[in-house]
């Protein structure tokens, strides 16, 4: 998220970006770090019980713009944030689940945090 008054000039990002990975580490990762030519991400989604589960890791450059756009999927509660500004930048991301729409309560009181939806970082 850009703070007020922060420069919008593009910054050179590393050709190879290292990201924290959690529940989403490739086999060759060491110490929960993966490498990518694209983006680091952190994602939160609900499992079948309604438990929020965070995963984080690396997204390749190809297609990552689309994945980071976080298009809402009906009946799937999830949110993703992406970053590229420095190595391991995704440990500072904090995606939160979108608020329930009233009709979602029809299915019963599933647990989730009632935060505002966050957008991805570039």
């Amino acid at each position: 998220k850009k703070e007020d008054g922060e420069s919008t000039a593009p910054t050179a990002r590393p050709k190879v970006l290292r990201c924290k990975c959690h529940h989403h580490c490739p086999e060759d990762s060491v110490n929960n770090i993966c490498s990518t030519d694209g983006y680091c991400f952190t994602m939160i989604e609900e499992d079948d019980s309604g438990t929020p589960v965070v995963t984080s890791g690396c997204l390749g450059l190809e297609g990552s713009d689309f994945q980071c756009r976080d298009t809402p999927i009906p009946h799937q509660r999830r949110s993703i944030e992406c970053c590229t500004e420095r190595n391991e930048c995704n440990k500072d991301l904090h995606p939160t689940l979108p608020p329930l729409k009233d009709r979602d309560f029809v299915d019963g009181p599933i647990h989730h945090k009632h935060h505002h939806h966050h957008h991805h970082h570039h």
């Epitope: 959690h22 019980s49 309604g50 929020p52 965070v54 440990k91 904090h94 019963g108 009181p109």
Partner: antibody, heavy 119, light 107 residues
Framework: QIQLVQSGPELKKPGETVKISCKAS????????MNWVKQAPGKGLKWMGW????????SSADDFKGRFAFSLETSASTAYLLINNLKNEDTATYFC????????????WGTGTTVTVSS | SFVMTQTPKFLLVSAGDRVTITCKAS??????VAWYQQKPGQSPKLLIY???NRYTGVPDRFTGSGYGTDFTFTISTVQAEDLAVYFC?????????FGSGTKLEMK
């Protein structure tokens, strides 16, 4: 008032099974989740998992998958923790704890059940 | 899973002292941190939720603050009945993890 009353202490042998109950009163049982937390002697707190009291769907932390099961008797406002094939390292106090809708802090805790596993 | 590093492990205090306990999270938790008090032989009790909100009936000498990865719990004026172990907990993502605890003891 709001209470979570757990079953009494258990002394078991390795390989046996134990079932702990947690009876809720003073609130609508199905509008709060029921969590289970382990505290080994002299140690800290470890979240084991929870059960969605509305849907009945449980979710376990990775360290508690396999031998541990969460269940409900909704008509009796009671949650259960079942531990199969008990091991010495299961010796601990087990707490049930209520979590409010949309949040994962635990606002009401059970009385605790001490399970001792010894041959 | 996410680690909550709690310091110190022990605190020797006198009645009237101001006490500060810290928890450092391994990941950005936003405001999603709670603090509990556990007296010997008792169940834990919720004191603070959402980093800084006092739970119902909790005296105002207990306060919490912080955001992201750094969280602080303060007792402004310690009383004898505050002797207990205090735990932080992240309630952002499963598995919900606790700090290792801070034991408050009288000098």
């Amino acid at each position: 008032q709001i209470q979570l009353v757990q079953s009494g202490p258990e002394l078991k042998k390795p390989g046996e099974t134990v079932k702990i109950s947690c009876k809720a009163s003073g609130y609508t049982f199905t509008t709060y989740g029921m969590n289970w937390v382990k505290q080994a002697p002299g140690k800290g707190l470890k979240w084991m998992g929870w059960i969605n009291t509305y849907s009945g769907v449980p979710s376990s932390a990775d360290d508690f998958k396999g031998r541990f099961a969460f269940s409900l008797e909704t008509s009796a406002s009671t949650a259960y923790l079942l531990i199969n094939n008990l091991k010495n390292e299961d010796t601990a106090t087990y707490f049930c704890a209520r979590s409010e809708l949309r949040n994962w802090y635990f606002d009401v805790w059970g009385t605790g059940t001490t399970v001792t596993v010894s041959s | 899973s996410f680690v909550m590093t709690q310091t110190p492990k022990f605190l020797l205090v006198s009645a009237g002292d101001r006490v500060t306990i810290t928890c450092k999270a391994s990941q950005n938790m936003g405001h999603d941190v709670a603090w509990y008090q556990q007296k010997p032989g008792q169940s834990p009790k919720l004191l603070i939720y959402s980093a800084s909100n006092r739970y119902t009936g909790v005296p105002d000498r207990f306060t919490g603050s912080g955001y992201g990865t750094d969280f602080t719990f303060t007792i402004s004026t310690v009383q004898a009945e505050d002797l207990a172990v205090y735990f932080c907990q992240q309630d952002y993502s499963s598995p919900f993890t606790f700090g290792s605890g801070t034991k408050l003891e009288m000098k």
